[in-house]
Interface confidence: low
């Protein structure tokens, strides 16, 4: 199953497949979940070595038993791939690391204004991996405000050093969100020209072209069919790229095909696994197990559920079968592809989803990275659980904000729904930015079921929870995906970097806004926040956060949205906007339903309504 | 078909210097870690040195350390092994080998170079 | 280091004999340990890695059993071509140690 703790002051050892450079923890677990054979990982922060080489070192690594042994290293932390793990599967990156400087092949620079434009062009040039930028203050005038634009053979920094007023970060490519736009055709009978980053043997073209996309550096790639003319170049795939970022020529060929990656793709990029079952065709690999199953889909799914599978055949042969069930050979290779493709078989064979972002509907999210009065403008992806719950009556208006917890969940405020509990004039929209964008054609999720707490009354503050069941279950997107849940009666964790989201007032006598805001707001303790509102009782399944001065806080609109806090990289639901003293007003924090207080009830109500569980709490 | 094909070896004095070659083929050499182990006349293996993918991280036995360097091109997928300060005790058949992923047995061997250390 | 230590280091058998040699490490390795064979003048070969897993290739009357500090590389039915000297190897931690090596000859 999907294991997303991590290990502080902990090293595993043994078992290394990979290793490289990468500025933290979760970059490294993201490389991990995207290496074909790694299973665990540990890293070395720049403060838990003197050894300057090994500095920001992430080991990837394997185990046939799943497990390595764990020595203690101080300042190290490791943790599994999040192969298996759903929604939290991305390869989008978006932090910014202060003080850094990824070292790659410099290849282009200029001079802007902002780390976030430099990431910006980064995301917009179809070589840029990674970047650098010196600040206003960085100590050699000359440089200062140049952005560095780098690529590397690995797609990952060839060193990491610690320097002053030097700001580091990655394409946003992986999260959708170039400018570029990308080639969507698959041209047959051609093939193209140019440096061959990788070889592996694919299926088909489609296959051909997911594994591109997900290589740090194929731009294009042609693949040869299963009857091209030279035997041993049969169904190749082979990854691509050239200097000007486009195949300098290309050649009619008979049986090849070939494409682009599709990474440049705006706002939707391919799953980064394979779900096509192939039949009449054997994969080869080196064998991992043998079992009988009933059917293939069944092998697939044996194989999904048995983390080092990477690919599986289901034989049809009499020999290889028992009555109704049948031999299903779990398989792996060095580099995730088959190392031999047999058609005219009796068999079928497929990949594992072990890398589908689907996923199991039980799993929360780690990953994305009442207008807000103080707030700023979000940008695309960075909370992708957010929804606005728009009302439908003569005229269509924004009302609630909410959080996607589930493929057919939202978890939302009770007193949205105060005098309009009817199903029928809600309309439910996820993976939006800019409420302007929304016209008549926008799809949009109807509502099933509204569950309002059994406690909650109207015109109080307690209990103010509900939850929506949508009517069809949501599809996992880099812009549309859940927030994890946190623990019952969380009560532990310190939470020091929470933010408030939703598209409401920018102030109290305001209107709602049209691009979702976000506003870093500190949490406060309910014995503080009781000082500040003396006619109300601030109980224990209430949160409260704000600034002393004021200045920063949700508002009308913001209503049910989320307050969300990270947690040793993860993002959690630690909060629902509830209600507070006018909006931002001085020594007034906003209040919060406290999420953790209400786990069994979240849980009883999504589990009863259709007998199986539909999302759960971290590990 | 996975080939190792080591180089560079021969009779050196004491105190000298000999730079091993391994050409890999026949597999995406970038993605491996590679080693050298090495085997003195009528005796048994010896594990000298280990290099990750990257070259970034590399690994030696107490016996070599700082006078041993291990390194890699992946651009011309090859392994190399610079020895300095040279001893008799390091007269061995040389062997270039790939490591298997994920359980560091290394799977492939070249058919090695002998370096005679001798006045 | 992790200390290595092979027994028989020799070992007289006959064709179509079963053949079991011993492998100890001085400390807990896991199931990290790997086989090899290797033949007078050539390269060593790998046979059996992580404690049982049988490298692709090789012929299934080679098994390997064995976790901890104690394992075992077992021949079932020893064939000409199998006198050869045969070498455990750690790969838990570094550096990597070779045992010294079981010599299978003709009895």
């Known amino acids: 199953g999907c294991l997303t703790q991590l290990y502080e002051n902990a090293f595993f050892r043994g078992g290394d497949v990979a290793s490289m450079y990468t500025p933290n923890a979760q970059y490294c677990q993201m490389r991990c979940t995207f290496h074909p054979r790694c299973l665990l990982f540990s890293f070395l922060p720049a403060s838990s070595i003197n050894d300057m080489e090994k500095r920001f070192g992430c080991f990837l690594k394997d185990s046939v038993t799943g497990t390595l042994p764990k020595v203690h290293r101080t300042g190290a932390v490791s943790g599994h791939s999040l192969k298996q793990c759903g929604h939290q599967i991305s390869a989008c990156h978006r932090d910014i690391y202060k003080g850094v400087d990824m070292r790659g092949v410099n290849f282009n620079v200029s001079k802007v204004s902002s780390v976030e434009e430099c990431q910006k062009r980064c995301t917009s040039n179809i070589r840029c991996q990674f970047f650098s930028y010196a600040t206003q203050t960085f100590h050699k005038a000359e440089y200062r405000n140049n952005c560095l634009l780098k690529y590397s053979p690995g797609g990952t920094p060839t060193a990491i050093k610690v320097l002053s007023n030097v700001e580091s970060g990655f394409s946003l490519k992986p999260c959708a969100l170039s400018e570029i736009g990308c080639h969507m055709n698959i041209f047959q009978h051609l093939a193209f020209s140019d440096v061959d980053v990788a070889r592996v043997l694919t299926p088909d073209a489609f296959v051909c072209r997911t594994i591109c996309t997900y290589h740090p550096n194929c731009l294009f790639f042609t693949f040869y069919t299963n009857v091209w003319k030279i035997e041993s170049q049969r169904n190749v795939c082979l990854l691509k790229t050239s200097e000007s970022g486009t195949p300098s020529s290309s050649t009619p060929q008979e049986n090849t095909i070939s494409g682009y990656s599709l990474l440049t793709c705006k706002r939707t990029l391919p799953e980064p696994c394979h779900s096509k079952i192939y039949p009449g065709v054997d994969f080869g690999g080196e064998e991992l197990n043998v079992t009988f199953v009933k059917g293939v889909n069944v092998c697939q799914e044996t194989c999904t559920k048995m983390i080092r599978c990477q690919f599986f055949t289901y034989s049809l042969l009499p020999e290889d079968c028992k009555e109704e069930k049948c031999k299903c050979f779990l398989r792996l290779s060095m580099d995730g592809s088959p190392t031999r493709i047999a058609y005219g078989t009796q068999g079928s064979s497929g990949y594992s989803l072990r890398l589908c972002n689907t996923g199991d509907n039980s799993v929360c999210t780690t990953k994305t990275s009442t207008r807000i009065v103080g707030g700023t403008n979000s940008s695309w992806g960075e909370w992708p659980w957010q929804v606005s719950l728009q009302v439908k009556l003569t005229a269509q208006r924004h009302l609630c904000g909410g959080s996607l917890i589930g493929h057919q969940w939202v978890l939302t405020a009770a007193h949205c729904f105060d005098g309009l509990p009817l199903q029928d004039v809600w309309r439910i929209y996820s993976g939006i930015l800019n409420l302007s964008d929304i016209t008549k054609d926008t799809p949009f999720s109807q509502i099933k079921e509204i569950i309002i707490h059994q406690n909650y009354k109207v015109s109080e503050g307690n209990h103010d929870i509900a939850l929506i069941k949508l009517q069809a279950p949501l599809n996992y997107t880099e812009f549309q995906k859940p927030i994890c849940l946190p623990s019952k009666g969380d009560t532990s964790t310190i939470y020091t970097n929470c933010w408030v989201t939703g598209w409401g007032f920018s102030k109290e006598k305001g209107e709602i806004q049209n691009i979702l805001q976000k506003v870093n707001i500190p949490l406060v303790t309910n014995e503080e926040c009781q000082k500040r509102y003396q006619d109300y009782k601030i109980t224990q399944r209430m949160v409260c956060a704000g600034y002393k001065e004021g200045g920063k806080d949700a508002c009308k609109g913001d209503s049910g949205g989320p307050l969300v806090c990270k947690h040793n990289g993860m993002w959690r639901l630690v909060g629902i906007t509830s209600w507070g003293e006018g909006c931002a007003r001085r020594e007034q924090p906003g209040v919060y339903t406290k999420v953790a207080e209400y786990m069994d009830w979240i849980l009883e109500k999504t589990q009863s309504s259709d007998g199986k569980a539909q999302m759960q709490s971290p590990a | 078909e996975v080939q190792l094909l080591e180089s560079g070896g021969g009779l050196v004095q004491p105190g000298g210097s000999l730079r091993l070659s391994c050409a890999a083929s026949?597999?995406?050499?970038?993605?491996?870690?590679m080693g050298w182990v090495r085997q003195a006349p009528g005796k048994g293996l010896e594990w000298v040195s280990g290099i990750y993918p990257s070259g970034g991280f590399t690994m030696y036995a107490d016996s070599v350390k700082g006078r041993f360097t291990i390194s890699r091109d992946n651009s011309k997928n090859t392994l190399y092994l610079q020895m300095n300060s040279l001893r008799a005790e390091d007269t061995a058949v040389y062997y270039c080998a790939r490591e298997s992923s994920g359980v560091a047995a290394p799977d492939y061997w070249g058919q090695g170079t002998l370096v005679t250390v001798s006045s | 280091d992790i200390q290595m230590t092979q027994s028989p280091s020799t070992l007289s058998a006959s064709v179509g004999d079963r053949v079991t040699i011993t492998c100890r490490a001085s400390q807990n390795i896991s199931s990290y340990l790997n086989w090899y064979q290797q033949k007078p003048g050539k390269a060593p070969k790998l046979l059996i890695y992580a404690a049982s897993s049988l490298q692709s290739g090789v012929p299934s009357r080679f098994s390997g059993s064995g976790s901890g500090t104690d394992f075992t590389l077992t021949i079932s039915s020893l064939q000409p071509e199998d006198f050869a000297t045969y070498s455990c190897q750690q790969s838990y931690s570094t550096p990597r140690t070779f045992g010294q090596g079981t010599k299978v000859e003709i009895k």
């Open positions: 026949g597999f995406t050499f970038s993605l491996y870690i």
